[in-house]
């Protein structure tokens, strides 16, 4: 069964920055992957960044940079200030949408006593929806 | 099936301000992104910016900073673009494109004359 | 940002015969983590909007005839078409789908003979 796994870790330099880093463990071709906060996407969540494999890489504030990192992962970078700047317990939502498999989603936020700069390691997180 | 419909023209006044719109259909208007071209005779084709509906922080190209605000209502599935201080070089033909350029709306003619 | 530069502006051709447009850009449009470039060539018919015709450099859009074809890497692509017709009327445009902004090349006007 694929997996999505979603790790979130706060910059010890900045503490209004956060990384996201996505993967998809799954054999299939991945076709598109959207990340996404407050909740997963189409679900009360607000989307950051949309990544095509072949169409490039969108992003809206506060997202600062999107970029593959892998063919199977991406991160994000997230800069913000006031209004638009994550906070702690902000819930991040990564979809990857392969062939065959479908859409695979899963979300993730800061673990509770991590310090800045430290983050847990990337395990998969429960996937929350299998179209 | 995919649809952005726009009005076929304006006319406006040197100095005024004009908000053209750009209704989609036929998918999920929260699901892709809307973006805003322009088109001048003899010039080719410019990215204005983008804005994902529910997400207040549209894009532009620096050159439209000053000239253009980006816009969506999602209870009309609509997408707007604000022009401001219109000027002669402001008249073109201005496409909204859904996602990744993959459907496009037939285009509002903008005449900018006294 | 990234300048796309077409060439030629124009060209004429008969119909049958084949064409090649090229498109330079300033800066490389390779995607190390997907090692795919990020251009679009797009086809503007007189009094309609541009139509998607090539993304990703060589990948054709859903319904795009296979007489249409994308090439290049880095900073230098091109479009062939093959048995040039005369519906191929139209000024074909590059774009990088790089990076903000996301520029468009001059264009390059096809007439048919």
């Known amino acids: 069964t694929p997996e999505v796994w979603v790790q979130v870790r706060m910059e010890a330099t900045e503490l209004s920055s956060f990384t996201i880093r996505c993967g998809f463990l799954g054999s299939g071709s991945i076709s598109l992957v959207t990340v996404s906060w407050g909740g997963p996407n189409g679900a009360g969540g607000t989307t950051l960044a949309v990544l095509h494999p072949e169409r490039g890489i969108r992003q809206w504030a506060p997202a600062r940079q999107a970029r593959w990192e892998t063919q199977s992962s991406i991160s994000l970078i997230l800069e913000g200030s006031g209004a638009s700047s994550p906070c702690a317990n902000t819930t991040f939502c990564c979809k990857f949408a392969s062939f065959p498999e479908g859409s695979w989603e899963a979300c993730g936020s800061l673990p509770p006593s991590s310090d800045p700069g430290l983050s847990a390691p990337p395990t998969p997180a429960p996937i929350l929806r299998a179209d | 099936q995919v649809q952005l419909q726009q009005p076929g023209a304006e006319l406006v006044k040197p100095g005024t301000s004009v908000k053209l719109s750009c209704k989609a259909s036929g998918y999920n208007f929260t699901s892709y992104w809307i973006n805003w071209v322009k088109l001048r005779p003899g010039q080719g084709l410019e990215w204005i910016g983008d804005i994902y509906p529910g997400n207040y922080s549209p894009n532009y190209n620096e050159k439209f900073l000053n000239k253009a605000t980006l816009t969506t209502d999602t209870a009309s599935s609509t997408a707007y673009m604000q022009l401001n201080n219109l000027a002669s070089e402001d008249s073109a033909v201005y496409y909204c494109?859904?996602?990744?350029?993959?459907?496009w709306g037939q285009g509002t003619t903008l005449i900018v004359s006294a | 940002d990234i300048v796309m530069t077409q060439s030629p502006s124009s060209l004429s051709v008969s119909a049958g015969e084949e064409v090649i447009m090229s498109c330079k850009s300033s800066?490389?449009?390779?995607?190390?983590?997907?090692?795919?470039?990020?251009l679009a060539w797009y086809q503007q018919k007189p009094g309609q909007p541009p139509k998607l015709l090539i993304y990703?450099?060589?990948t054709r859009e859903s319904g795009v005839p296979d007489r249409f074809t994308g090439s290049g890497s880095g900073t230098d692509f091109t479009l062939t078409i093959n048995n040039v017709q005369a519906e191929d009327l139209a000024i074909y445009y590059c774009q990088n789908d790089h990076s903000y902004p996301y520029t468009f090349g001059g264009g390059t006007k096809l007439e048919i003979k």
């Open positions: 494109a859904s996602g990744y350029f993959d459907y």
């Open positions: 990703g450099t060589s």
């Open positions: 800066q490389s449009l390779l995607n190390s983590g997907t090692q795919k470039n990020y």
